[in-house]
Each structure stands twice: as structure tokens, then as C-alpha cells.
Amino acid sequence: DVERTTCPPEKEVHEIDENLIFYKKRELEACVDAALLAAQMDRVDAIPFTYEQLDVLKHKLDELYPQGYPESVIRHLGHLFLKMSPEDIRKWNVTSLETLKALLKVSKGHEMSAQVATLIDRVVVGRGQLDKDTADTLTAFCPGCLCSLSPERLSSVPPSVIGAVRPQDLDTCGPRQLDVLYPKARLAFQNMSGSEYFVKIRPFLGGAPTEDLKALSQQNVSMDLATFMKLRREAVLPLTVAEVQKLLGPHVEGLKVEEQHSPVRDWILKQRQDDLDTLGLGLQGGIPNGYLILDLSVREALS
């Protein structure tokens, strides 16, 4: 913590300006009034403070606002944002997209994924849901940031927003996130024709259930291997060899390359070797011919 000293009269600060760059840490601590700093935050980013000096200014704001900074301060944090921890940001209430844009710009090029994720979360909470304007801001200023939102937050996304989402915005989304987004995408694109629908729904298919994959296999979609590899393992396992062949079309040959990777590996283990052989790819590891497959889950459901 910064040492407490009294401010020499000649060092008293009446406004936030460039003279402050010559102040030592303890002088800044003693001479800068936190309320003045908060009122003139818009000047701070134009002054080339050292990281050490920024630490002192942050400490001042933390003391003034122990429950979290007001948005009027947050909006003008500038490079001071780089000093914020996720715990700091969790205390904020942010509703303005201008504030979000300003801080996203500052964070660019810095390792701040946790802080940015928390900031976006606070914006979504502050605005009540991930509305179209917020989604547009994210796609423009922070590609991929949509996936920093938790599945819980993504649950509040209205289907109308889904149209603004580009494939690259979903690149870092995990299984649960896609599980939440997929039904919304299905709803958003339901009136599109077959081929157009597939192009739109493809990035969301990591959340698709088995029955939807079966339906797609009847539509000559020719799914690429990269998309297939992102499908939920538990959704792929019940697919038959014929269904996977129809789903992948000419890309079915790629199964050989991915033979050792999930979900392909797990799917192979569930298929009869006879059926796998019909693909002519030399896939190995299926259920040997002549073995009886007991589906105990069916017996349980009937009992």
C-alpha cells in the first residue's frame, strides 16, 4: 500500500493535468483528491502516467468507490482499465455501449480476456439481456467475445439477435454455449430454404441433438469434417453409418484422417465392423461381426 504523507503546499493539486507526471507515487497519493480525480477522469488518459502512477490513481478510486465505480468514471478509464481485475469489474453496473466500445479498444493487444469477459457480462446484466445493439458492438469491436459469455447469459439472447452472429464469432464457443445457442438459431433461420438454412445453421451445429443431425442427413448438405468434429459426442454416437455417410457426402473420406479423435473414434466403437467396411475407408475398431448388441437403456425404459 502507498505510504501516507501530507501534501507539501506547493504540490497541491487543483486540476488533473500534465504536471502530475512529475509527482512521485507518495506525492500523488497525498496531493490528489479522489473526488477531483473522479470528476476529471476524462483528462487522465491524455496524460502519459507511468504504470506505477496509474496504480496510485486506481487506489484513489477504489477508496472513493468501494462498492464499484459509477459509469461516469468507467467510461473515461482509458488505460487505467488495464489495471482492473475481474473482481473490480464485477462490482460495476455498465449500460452504455459507448463505455463498452471505449474499454474494448483500450484492451486490444493486451492479455485481458478475463477482464473483457467480465466487462461484457456486466454490460449484458446492465442492459437486461444481450440485445442486438450489444451483439453488433461485440462483433464489430471484439470478434469472438460472444463466447466469453456464460451459457446462462447466452440463454437471454433473443433469436432475433442470432442473425447478426458471424461464424467466426462462434469459434471459441464451448459445448454448453452452443447447446444454448443452437435452438435459438434454429428458430431464427426456420423460414430459410434448405441450402441457405444449412449455411446459416452450420456454425451452431455443435449444439444440435441427434434427431436434427438425422434430419440433415436426408438433405444432401455435405457437412465438412471441421463441423462434424465439433458436433456433440453424445449427438453423434446414435447415428448409423448410412446417416453419417449421407451427412458428410463427399467429405466422408475425412473420417479416416480423424479416426483416432473424438467424436469419430467413439462413433466407430459403436458401429458394426460390417457397416464400417461398406464405407471402404479401412476404418477399424467397430463391433466384430457375430456379436450381439444389447441396448440396456431400452430395457430400462420399458421396465
Epitope: P151, E152, P175, R176, V180, E234, S262
Partner: antibody, heavy 118, light 113 residues
Framework: EVQLVESGGGLIQPGGSLRLSCAVS????????MTWVRQAPGKGLEWVSV???????YYADSVKGRFTISRDNSKNTLYLQMNSLRAEDTAVYYC????????????WGQGTLVTVSS | DIVMTQSPDSLAVSLGERATINCKSS????????????LAWYQQKPGQPPKLLIY???TRESGVPDRFSGSGSGTDFTLTISSLQAEDVAVYYC?????????FGQGTKVEIK
Amino acid sequence: EVQLVESGGGLIQPGGSLRLSCAVSGFTVSSKFMTWVRQAPGKGLEWVSVIYSGGKTYYADSVKGRFTISRDNSKNTLYLQMNSLRAEDTAVYYCARDSGGWGYFDYWGQGTLVTVSS
Amino acid sequence: DIVMTQSPDSLAVSLGERATINCKSSQSVLYSSNNKNYLAWYQQKPGQPPKLLIYWASTRESGVPDRFSGSGSGTDFTLTISSLQAEDVAVYYCQQYYSTPPTFGQGTKVEIK
């Protein structure tokens, strides 16, 4: 303060039914992903079911078709309806809050014991 | 389903000494797209529900003492208690949340030597 309080456990005969409740305070049950996890006496933890904030549900294979997870938003309560109970369903049943919907659990109730025996 | 296997089943450690628990998953729980390991650790004391200690393999839950740390990636993970305290006597579980159903390890009992 977040609190989850389970109730409804007890002794039940094989083939019988039971409904467990989990009364929630400190957050709204409709806005969170909520889960049931069970623990057989002296054994480890087994995930049972989840209900997403959007209403989607998943079940462990061992309970599929027999158990139903639901919630009553007005009562801020989570439920687990258990039918066709078997001896192997004997366990302490915990309701837990799924943190952010990611799949790990940050708040747990104290649990309610379900004993299936004739 | 992804099978989680912990070792050892039980562990006796002197007060102040380091305790190490291993957890192995039957398939990788590292999601390559976001470089996150979908793995959590819990502590369960007798007669109590589990308590979340670690998530994303290495992120400590708030309020958890910093003697608890998590490490590892892909299929092999470790929970370390750097200096065992009397109140750390419990059963520890790892859990994957990479795919549905989420699955737990069988548990490791930590006792004082």
C-alpha cells in the same frame, strides 16, 4: 445470501414414487441452470439431471424415462419427480446451482436422503 | 461417458506437508477452440455437501485458501494442498464438465498422518 434447501426424501418401496423439492433463496431459480446430484451411502457423486434457464432438460441414462426435473418460478423451487424407484436409487440427493451454466456447481443444498427398500 | 479416475484412493499426510491428488480423464477435457480445461475440484467433509474449490482446472473459487491449487491439461490433472491443515481432512473429487453427462472421479480421502 444464497441458500438451497432440499426436502421430500424418505423411505419408499421399490416401484414407488417420490417428489423432491429444493427451495431456493438468494437468486431466482428461473435464471439459473439447476442440477440434481446424488450420492449413494459411502459412495461417490453421480450427476442425475439438469434444467437450463431456458427450460431444456438432460438426464443421466440410469434415470432417463423415470425421473423428471422441473421448477416452479413463482415458488422459486426446483423439483425432481422420481417414479419406478429401484434399490439402486437409494442415495442422498443434492440440488446444486450450476455456475454460469458451465457445468460445475458453486452452491449445494445439504441433501435429502431417499431410501428405496421393501 | 467420460470416465474420471483419481489416485490415490486415500492419502495420509503430516500437518504442514504437501498433499497431491491426481485425476485422469478417459478423453481430453481441453476444448481446443477456447483453450479451456473443463475440470473442477470439490472438497466434501463428513455429513456435508461438496464444496467447489477449483474450476477451469486451475481457477480458485473465491474464499478458497491459496494453499489449494489446481494444474494440468488435457487428460491429466492435479490438486495440490501446499501445506495440509487439520480442517483439510475430507474427500476430494474431480469432475469434468466437457460433455453431458458431467462425471466425477471416485474420490480421494485425505487424512492426517
